[in-house]
């Protein structure tokens, strides 16, 4: 009976859900050969991007975990995470506590002139407390990071501060002034909510704004510092004290990085020496004449930082500010985030090892992990095969490239380290879930800081993840030569062991291949591959640039094609590698399935799944993005893949079946 020879429909609930998802997001009345983006994403244009939707699903899963009444072991990490989440959700208690807990914090810091007791304590004492106890850095940032010469050696880095105001160095004066005006209103609100009188609040807020403005003017752009060789300057604490004497560097850093033992001869990495000199001068000037304004500036900054843990009046003030600033910088309004999502994120930040274990146990069991590893192996093998056939690589470069792939570590789902049972069951003994939500947050901030310092101090054979297991961003770490695929990414609709393989290869597989190609991004930079056939490489380069430039863009979409080249190359190559791996899989294994009632062959489903990953609404930020706008991320790679035109029977010369193509990878 020949009818049974074709791929059979997959009718499990996961497949039916996926089919419904595809039907809901696609617009099949559009011709796939001219606008595959609309064919796959037409109805989803107004929705979040597919990654955001998945991130929300993952957070919902964490929410369910945290909301199920479980009989956790008393005092365990799980119990503390659960208690923290619930106290975050208890808005009645937060409202009832009002500003009391915050005012207590302000008093501990020596008070301020706006309200409450003012004890005019030592400037460096306040700064030391802010840095070490509250994780707040008003004048500069200090953090542990890799030593520029030895990425596995941690070293204290002193960097420019992060301003709460979204200032850019190329901002026109009018916008700059408007931003500060809105921010002044916000600071006035904070001071008033904390009991201050308008006259005092305005006086202190205005001075705080002027301090911020002056500090901002001291910053030097990254490119300028890089060009002058001043982006990584090794200095000792003693030398720093000489350059910027207003700060008691040793005591502030010692308190912040306990239990590290620091001495005046300790070396640090400084990222903007000139800024620190000017900042110190400003502080000294203010300590002479306006000590209390300096204190208010520091306290206001802390209040801004802590406002998410405060009552609804503070949240509302913050929301209004964000809305105004987005209008000024011509960004679309931010959709309101529900309380549960904020609480899940906070809990995830402070109790990551515990939540990682709970999430992975539920969302990325052994069978899913094993299927994901098999998929990765297939993709990696296809890449190795492909490297042998690149016209611009000579044999020596090919061997080097293959070795690089062979030595690559992969971390799938969650880091081995994070899933160690003793870590997952961590008891967080130093966390006191206090009488108020703010106190609980502060206790968690201190605990997290201590854990970060400890983790840097321990010899760490494994890669330290930059994302949480429930995140949706894969990445390649150059320094550790490891590629990371968090469990949160390898979820429906991108991946499921029960999906047709076309879906897994087209969606998750192309993401994996894309990340693998980032191993070689250095080769694509000018002069990055001396042993390559640079003429052929240059030709492929130009060809790809021209290919992308030829695509029409939807109205009001802009992007910078010099920023996006490397990502475009990884998109095109990633799709080709995933397709090669999938084709090989089809040849070797029969029994492929399809999604019912979509009327798409396995190969068509492969491309449909690839496009699904890219579904999202273009946004104004695309002009600063290293990725192309979503239309291009679909059409660029599909039009570069002859198989696409073959399987969708596209007429020669159609937009997605051009007469000539480029091959970089």
């Amino acid at each position: 009976n020949f009818q049974n020879c074709g791929p059979r429909p997959c009718e499990t609930s996961v497949c039916l859900d996926l089919r419904d998802h595809y039907l809901a997001s696609g617009n099949t009345s559009v011709a796939p050969c001219t606008d595959f983006f609309s064919f796959a994403c037409g109805r989803a244009k107004e929705t979040n991007n597919s990654f955001q939707e998945l991130a929300t699903k993952n957070k919902n899963r964490l929410r369910r975990i945290l909301e199920v009444q479980n009989s956790w072991h008393p005092g365990s990490g799980e119990e503390k995470a659960f208690q923290f989440y619930n106290s975050c959700m208890d808005t009645l208690a937060i409202e009832a506590a009002g500003t009391g807990p915050l005012r207590q914090v302000i008093e501990e810091l020596g008070g301020w002139r706006i309200s409450g007791k003012w004890t005019s304590l030592n400037f460096n004492r306040t700064l030391r407390l802010l840095m070490s106890q509250y994780g707040h850095f008003p004048f500069f940032r200090a953090y542990l990071g890799p030593h520029p010469a030895s990425p596995h050696t941690p070293v204290i880095q002193i960097d420019q501060p992060e301003f709460d105001v979204p200032l850019k160095q190329d901002q026109e004066q009018k916008i700059y002034a408007q931003i500060f005006r809105e921010y002044l209103t916000y600071l006035n609100q904070l001071g008033t909510l904390l009991g201050g009188d308008p006259s005092k609040v305005q006086e202190h807020s205005s001075l705080s704004i002027s301090i911020t403005s002056r500090l901002f003017q001291f910053l030097r752009p990254l490119e300028q510092r890089r060009a002058q060789g001043k982006l990584f300057q090794m200095v000792t604490i003693d030398q720093l004290k000489e350059m910027a004497p207003a700060i008691d560097w040793l005591s502030c850093l010692q308190a912040t990085f306990t239990p590290m033992s620091l001495s005046p001869s300790q070396s640090l990495v400084v990222h903007d020496v000139e800024y620190l000199k000017n900042m110190s001068q400003l502080v000294e000037e203010m300590l002479l004449k306006q000590r209390d304004f300096l204190q208010s500036h520091m306290i206001l900054g802390l209040v801004v930082t802590l406002s998410p843990a405060l009552d609804s009046q503070f949240q509302e003030a913050r929301r209004k500010l964000s809305q105004k600033l987005r209008e000024l910088t011509e960004q679309p309004p931010m959709p309101a985030r529900p309380r549960w999502m904020k609480c899940v994120e906070e809990t995830g930040t402070f109790f990551e090892p515990t939540l990682a274990a709970l999430f992975v146990r539920e969302a990325f069991g052994p069978s899913t992990r094993s299927a994901a590893m098999k998929l990765f192996t297939a993709i990696r093998d296809a890449l190795i095969t492909r490297l042998r056939n690149l016209p611009w690589m000579n044999e020596e470069t090919q061997n080097m490239a293959q070795d690089k792939v062979a030595q690559l570590q992969v971390e799938m789902g969650a880091s081995e380290w994070a899933l160690k049972p003793e870590l997952a069951r961590q008891e967080y003994n130093d966390i006191q879930l206090g009488s108020s939500f703010l106190q609980s947050v502060l206790s968690c901030v201190r605990s997290l800081r201590a854990r970060i310092v400890q983790s840097f101090l321990q010899p760490h054979p494994q890669h330290r993840w930059k994302v949480s297991p429930w995140d949706v961003n894969a990445y390649y770490s150059v320094s550790d030569h490891v590629v990371v695929f968090p469990a949160g990414l390898l979820q429906p609709p991108f991946f499921h062991p029960g999906y047709p393989r076309a879906v897994n290869f087209g969606a998750a597989g192309s993401i994996m291949a894309h990340e693998l190609l980032h191993i070689f991004y250095q080769l694509l930079l000018p002069g990055g591959c001396l042993a390559c056939d640079n003429h052929a490489l240059q030709e492929a380069h130009l060809c790809l640039k021209r290919h992308y430039a030829a695509f029409p863009l939807p109205s009001r979409t802009s992007f910078n094609d010099s920023l996006t080249f490397l990502e475009n190359a990884a998109d095109v190559g990633g799709l080709a590698i995933a397709l090669q791996a999938y084709s090989k899989r089809l040849l070797r294994h029969h029994g492929e399935t399809v999604l019912p009632s979509l009327d798409l062959s396995p190969q068509q489903i492969f491309f449909r799944s690839y496009a699904q990953v890219m579904c999202r609404k273009p946004s104004p930020q695309d002009s600063h993005d290293t990725h192309s706008p979503p239309h291009l991320r679909v059409h660029g790679p599909l039009s570069s893949t002859p198989a696409f035109a073959r399987y969708f029977r596209c007429a020669r010369g159609a937009l997605l079946n051009p007469s000539s193509r480029c091959q970089l990878w």
Partner: antibody
Framework: QVQLKESGPGLLAPSQSLSITCTVS????????VYWVRQPPGKGLEWLGI???????NYQSVLRSRLSITKDDSKSQVFLKLNSLQTDDTATYYC??????????WGQGTLVTVSA | DIVLTQSPASLAVSLGQRAIISCKAS??????????MHWYQQRPGQQPKLLIY???NLEAGVPTRFSGSGSRTDFTLNIHPVEEDDAATYYC?????????FGGGTRLEIK
């Protein structure tokens, strides 16, 4: 607890100067503002001026030329001085602490009569 | 200066009934969203006593029979149910800008 007590001269003649001391306890004058309010017999309340924790002052506009408010933080005392008295300066003079959120703590008041 | 006009100048209310006192400002007393209007009670021969601060916040120890509402230029003090003890003069006061000012007062008499 917070307490404020005014002490004044009672009776003064026109053109003389009025000096009242407000002695406080239960809080520090470096942290909080203290203001003065007066109330003529059988009439309403009139705000006179304030001295803040940092020593800065704000005054009622019509009295600015005749009025000064000073303090001695170490003695926890605030002083009101009103020059060139007229009979319509007759009133009960109150000092009050400006607490956070404008929560106020008042003294008992001291009656000052200006009479020829 | 911000002028505060209280009405009525006096009112007589039966025990257990509701007393409503209004205070209108000549310009807004709102600063960045917070209305800086306060209410005082003054019994004969005593200093004024704060009842409500910043429009609607009850001072510690003040019975919940007292409540305040309003925004920008129009404010109200509500007393319900009125008790014998509430016979006094009531003043509104603004601290939005200098000079701080008081309303002319409302005398409440219990019938």
């Amino acid at each position: 607890q917070v307490q404020l007590k005014e002490s004044g001269p009672g009776l003064l003649a026109p053109s003389q100067s009025l000096s009242i001391t407000c002695t406080v306890s239960g809080f520090s004058l470096t942290s909080y503002g203290v203001y003065w309010v007066r109330q003529p017999p059988g009439k309403g309340l009139e705000w006179l001026g304030i001295i803040w924790g940092d020593g800065s002052t704000n005054y009622q506009s019509v009295l600015r030329s005749r009025l000064s408010i000073t303090k001695d933080d170490s003695k926890s005392q605030v002083f009101l001085k009103l020059n060139s008295l007229q009979t319509d300066d007759t009133a009960t003079y109150y000092c009050a602490k400006r607490g956070d959120y404008d929560v106020a703590y008042w003294g008992q008041g001291t009656l000052v009569t200006v009479s020829a | 200066d911000i002028v505060l006009t209280q009405s009525p100048a006096s009112l007589a209310v039966s025990l257990g009934q509701r007393a409503i006192i209004s205070c209108k400002a000549s310009q807004t007393v709102s600063f960045v969203g917070t209305s800086l209007m306060h209410w005082y009670q003054q019994r004969p021969g005593q200093q004024p006593k704060l009842l409500i601060y910043r429009t609607s916040n009850l001072e510690a120890g003040v019975p919940t029979r007292f409540s305040g509402s309003g925004s920008r230029t129009d404010f109200t003090l509500n007393i319900h149910p009125v008790e014998e003890d509430d016979a006094a003069t009531y003043y509104c006061q603004q601290s939005r800008e200098f000079p701080w000012t008081f309303g002319g007062g409302t005398r409440l008499e219990i019938k």
